[in-house]
């Protein structure tokens, strides 16, 4: 029969695991919100106004199903910030693009871990910034929907 000490330690482990899952869920929801905010601003901006925004190429992973695949998103945050910096104007304003991208990067690292040994396998096909954001939004939604509540 299990002792009281082993029962309490397994309960603590379960609670810790549940807490980690809740945190992971919160981080995913935060990342999803940030990506949706960016996409919303770009779409409200009437994509057509800035051809230079849509001429930029972004790279997507061959397949993204796990949190470690967020490395592929982290790898593209530099170019994403570059596009945001370039597209600042009267009708498309992000108060602090650097801070916005920095927050996304922090959330991504919390989710995938700080180990950068995983090398992203990018797809041969590239995407516009709009399609890039849509793809990562779908990724977050998929992980959230399959996570234990």
């Amino acid at each position: 029969a299990p002792t009281s000490s082993s029962t309490s330690s397994s309960t603590a482990e379960a609670q810790q695991q549940q807490q980690q899952q809740q945190q992971q869920q919160q981080h995913l929801e935060q990342l999803l919100m940030d990506l949706q905010e960016l996409l919303s601003r770009m779409e409200n901006y009437r994509n057509l106004k800035l051809p230079r925004m849509l001429t930029f190429k972004f790279y997507l992973p061959k397949q993204a199903t796990e949190l470690k695949d967020l490395q592929c998103l982290e790898d593209e945050l530099g170019p994403l910030r570059h596009v945001l910096d370039l597209t600042q104007s009267k009708s498309f304003q992000l108060e602090d693009a650097e801070n916005f991208i920095s927050n996304i990067r922090v959330t991504v690292v919390k989710l995938k871990g700080s180990d950068n040994t995983f090398e992203c396998q990018f797809d041969d096909e590239s995407a516009t910034v709009v399609d890039f954001l849509r793809r990562w939004i779908a990724f977050c939604q998929s992980i959230i929907s399959t996570s234990p509540q």
């Epitope: 009437r46 057509l48 190429k57 370039l86 590239s126």
Partner: antibody, heavy 117, light 109 residues
Framework: EVQLVQSGAEVKKPGESLKISCKGS????????IGWVRQMPGRGLEWMGT????????RYSPSFQGQVTTSADKSISTAYLQWGSLRASDTAMYYC??????????WGQGTMVTVSS | SYELTQPPSVSVSPGQTARITCSGD??????AYWYQQKPGQAPVLVIY???ERPSGIPERFSGSSSGTTVTLTISGVQAEDEADYYC???????????FGGGTQLTVLG
């Protein structure tokens, strides 16, 4: 049908001014950039600049900055390219083209400008 | 100023495959577009965003991209494909558009 119709051929003398036009139809003219492209006789295409008719935001190639002016009148769905003082080297075919998210997808038929004394 | 480099001419026999390259430093981050221009006519878009084909353009036209080079491929070239082909893209800031110098495709025979 989506199309751009340009004004007719022009023959001018050096030093004269000129304004050529490009009228859009079959789409919302306001919300697509219009680009201008030069093609000198027997030569390739050169991007001159673009204008966004909704607010007349303009971008010029460094090679054409200060040499030409683009403008637009969204009320009549027309973009313009103008010169204050023409030179013989301005002799060329000038195309307007609509820039959408998928490049210069619709082109005008071109306006031939000849500058000769 | 930013430049795109194309070979001045390419010659192929009917039915063969023609490949026209275009190179530029910004191409890893900027999409490329290809236009066909026949004598006395306005250019026509044949490939957009590196690899996409507009409706109405024959399937024998395709595009690919690798690093600083993009390629227009015409498989099973036909006599009617004889024309000048131009690549177009933007500088690294996306501000200025630019055309390559153009490639004259000659269909032999």
């Amino acid at each position: 049908e989506v199309q751009l119709v340009q004004s007719g051929a022009e023959v001018k003398k050096p030093g004269e001014s000129l304004k050529i036009s490009c009228k859009g139809s079959g789409y919302n003219f306001d919300t697509y950039w219009i680009g201008w492209v030069r093609q000198m006789p027997g030569r390739g295409l050169e991007w001159m600049g673009t204008i966004y008719p909704a607010d007349s935001d303009t971008r010029y190639s460094p090679s054409f900055q200060g040499q030409v002016t683009t403008s637009a009148d969204k009320s009549i769905s027309t973009a313009y390219l103008q010169w204050g003082s023409l030179r013989a080297s301005d002799t060329a075919m000038y195309y307007c083209a609509r820039f959408s998210s998928s490049a210069y997808d619709i082109w005008g038929q071109g306006t031939m400008v000849t500058v000769s004394s | 100023s930013y430049e795109l480099t194309q070979p001045p001419s390419v010659s192929v026999s009917p039915g063969q495959t023609a490949r026209i390259t275009c190179s530029g430093d910004a191409l890893p981050r900027q999409f490329a577009y290809w236009y066909q221009q026949k004598p006395g006519q306005a250019p026509v878009l044949v490939i957009y965003k590196d690899t996409e084909r507009p409706s109405g353009i024959p399937e024998r036209f395709s595009g690919s991209s690798s690093g600083t080079t993009v390629t227009l491929t015409i498989s099973g070239v036909q006599a009617e494909d004889e024309a000048d082909y131009y690549c177009q893209s933007a500088d690294s800031s996306g501000t200025y558009h630019v055309f390559g110098g153009g490639t004259q495709l000659t269909v032999l025979g």
